[in-house]
Amino acid sequence: LVPHLGDREKRDSVCPQGKYIHPQNNSICCTKCHKGTYLYNDCPGPGQDTDCRECESGSFTASENHLRHCLSCSKCRKEMGQVEISSCTVDRDTVCGCRKNQYRHYWSENLFQCFNCSLCLNGTVHLSCQEKQNTVCTCHAGFFLRENECVSCSNCKKSLECTKLCLPQIENVKGTEDSGTT
């Protein structure tokens, strides 16, 4: 099966790699602009230079292109706890990330929020915190996992899933309640 190509991809495939077809004259292949630059004017004829200009501050192109405008630099979302890992340059977008001991939770493909890694208090670290995944905790006896935190079995209600994990504790509590002195 041949993948569906857009008009621009169809036009570009006529020219060798690193070149694109002139929009007004499909017999001319112009050289693409280097990353960090954008297309100011198409090449006037075969073998003649494409007029490429450097991206202005606050914009970039990360690969060779024939874009009429550079792309705007991304801004890290402070409200999501993001910090700037590296600034935008003419050939690379801003890189955003999280602080130490935090992980990314992706709300959608390009939108993430930073959350603190769980410390596994009253438990042990089963899997360490990763860039995109919280710590996985294993709880000590007498504790159960709720929302990735180890909670005392004394907070386990009969209706919750914790009853299986906390069953010995629940039995013990019942046992001590039942055993009255005679």
Partner: nanobody
């Protein structure tokens, strides 16, 4: 067909409370993050709060943090927003929104379906 139906809006005095609900249908509710987004009169859209599919991760705008609480009941396919200590500046149309499938969302507009909205008016 995806449907999101908000309810619970109305007129409330400053300092009062309201609970908004959003009944979802036409998709597997428990597999998607959900959100509340609002639009004040003459203003743009503002992200209010998000909740992930299991309710483990939440986001609150600075303007509502500590006053609003987002929650969901996956067994009832319903999203909630408990709004306390309401202020005049909370007056807006509140929309329930579904996060787009992971690969089809984008940073500026990560939602693919919206409800019709419910009006919240905070006034004395």
């Amino acid at each position: 067909e995806v449907q999101l139906l908000e309810s619970g809006g109305g007129l409330v005095q400053p300092g009062g409370s309201l609970r908004l609900s959003c009944a979802a249908s036409g998709f597997t509710f428990h597999k998607y993050g959900m959100a509340w987004v609002r639009q004040a009169p003459g203003k743009g859209l503002e992200w209010v709060s998000f909740i992930d599919l299991a309710g483990l991760h939440t986001y609150y705008a600075d303007s509502v943090r500590g006053r609003f609480t987002i929650s969901r009941d996956n067994s009832k396919n319903t999203l909630y927003l408990q709004m306390n200590s309401l202020r005049a500046e909370d007056t807006a149309v509140y929309y329930c929104a579904k996060f787009a499938t992971y690969s089809s969302g984008n940073e500026e507009q990560p939602f693919d379906y919206w409800g019709q909205g419910t009006l919240v008016t905070v006034s004395s």
